[in-house]
């Protein structure tokens, strides 16, 4: 792969071993101003696999508020507006990075954590082949 | 709101002003071992709004690899396996936190950045505007 030369203006770090502690500027560079998913689109209502958004709050985590999708139905909405159980609504999940205060209640010390969140729902055909 | 007392064992921080620099342990606490979304589920193939996953790599970002969903069709797949253009496949997007090396090429100095990623696709009824 390509070796990128280290910038000579980098801050010093004492310990190069893992667990590695780095400096992180929390002044977020944010290209996306709209953080409430309910406002950003109404797909959650118009989807054939509609979902509700639940607010998950944790003061020991950054970001402290995460929205979790929960599919409204087991089946999917058909052309007549009824739930069709031949198909299934399933949550689309994604692993995201969050900062967890460590030690707890510390304002300036965090640990990276990966969590799995449900972002929305999609309509799928049932599993027809079982993978052993 | 509830005020959580500060832990006396917290590391010192020089500057309490924003932009705030904090210490982050990069030894990730990961509850989810499966990071390749293609292995975690085959929803991208079984969905009525199927999608392809594209690998987005950036060595100046942490995580350096992010998977982006791109809907395969403008319409949705109907019961006959054909694309139905009365409905639309749309990407479900989510804002995620990443760490951006700042200054560039520095191994131990980052800035938090919010980016918008497409996680998967869902099938929606099109918006119908009635002209008065």
């Amino acid at each position: 792969g390509i070796t990128i030369p280290r910038n000579p203006g980098c801050p010093n770090s004492e310990d190069k071993n893992f667990p590695r502690t780095v400096m992180v500027n929390l002044n977020i560079h944010n290209r996306n101003t709209n953080t409430n998913p309910k406002r950003s689109s109404d797909y959650y209502n118009r989807s054939t696999s509609p979902w509700n958004l639940h607010r998950n709050e944790d003061p020991e985590r950054y970001p402290s508020v995460i929205w979790e999708a929960k599919c409204r139905h087991l089946g999917c909405i058909n052309a007549d507006g009824n739930v069709d159980y031949h198909m299934n609504s399933v949550p689309i999940q994604q692993e995201i990075l969050v900062l967890r205060r460590e030690p707890p209640h510390c304002p300036n010390s965090f640990r990276l954590e990966k969590i799995l969140v449900s972002v929305g729902c999609t309509c799928v055909t049932p599993i027809v082949h079982h993978v052993a | 709101g509830i005020t959580i007392p500060r832990n006396p064992g917290c590391p010192n921080s020089e500057d309490k002003n924003f932009p705030r620099t904090v210490m982050v342990n990069l030894n990730i606490h990961n509850r989810n071992t499966n990071t390749n979304p293609k292995r975690s589920s085959d929803y991208y193939n079984r969905s009525t709004s199927p999608w392809n996953l594209h690998r987005n790599e950036d060595p100046e970002r942490y995580p350096s690899v992010i998977w982006e969903a791109k809907c395969r069709h403008l319409g949705c797949i109907n019961a006959d396996g054909n694309v139905d253009y009365h409905m639309n496949s749309v990407p479900i997007q989510q804002e995620i936190l990443v760490l951006r090396r700042e200054p560039p090429h520095c191994p131990n100095s980052f800035r938090l950045e919010k980016i918008l990623v497409s996680v998967g696709c869902t099938c929606v009824t099109p918006i119908v505007h009635h002209v008065a």
């Epitope: 087991l74 159980y85 198909m87 299934n88 799928v124 049932p126 079982h130 | -």
Partner: nanobody
């Protein structure tokens, strides 16, 4: 823990009928009761799925018009009625249950062998 037990398999002639039963013990069937089969050297495939209301939500093309399913929720039992059996129906037949078959099946039976001779 729910346990599924199949019965009713055996050796039959082509054109005969068989009725398989699946009893859920230690709990109730979930939203979907399903029948899978696995022929020698092949993967396990879904042949029929029954929703809690009793409606059939999936029938594999290979068994359409010959196989049908039912369930009696009060007896925690699902049935697979197989008519006009063919040699290619020879397989181990498994019962499964799912809360959401889009995500996966939660419980599986041990299977019952069905052999159709010509």
């Amino acid at each position: 823990e729910v346990q599924l037990v199949e019965s009713g398999g055996g050796l039959v002639q082509a054109g005969d009928s068989l009725r398989l039963s699946c009893v859920a013990s230690g709990g109730t069937f979930s939203n979907y009761a399903a029948w899978f089969r696995q022929a020698p050297g092949k993967g396990r495939e879904l042949i029929l799925s029954i929703f809690r209301s009793g409606s059939i939500t999936y029938t594999a093309d290979s068994v359409k018009g010959r196989f049908t399913g039912s369930r009696v929720n009060t007896k925690n039992t699902a049935y697979l009625q197989m008519n006009n059996l063919k040699p290619e129906d020879t397989a181990v037949y498994y019962c499964a249950s799912a809360y959401n078959p889009g995500i996966g099946y939660d419980y599986w039976g041990q299977g019952t062998q069905v052999t159709v001779s010509s």
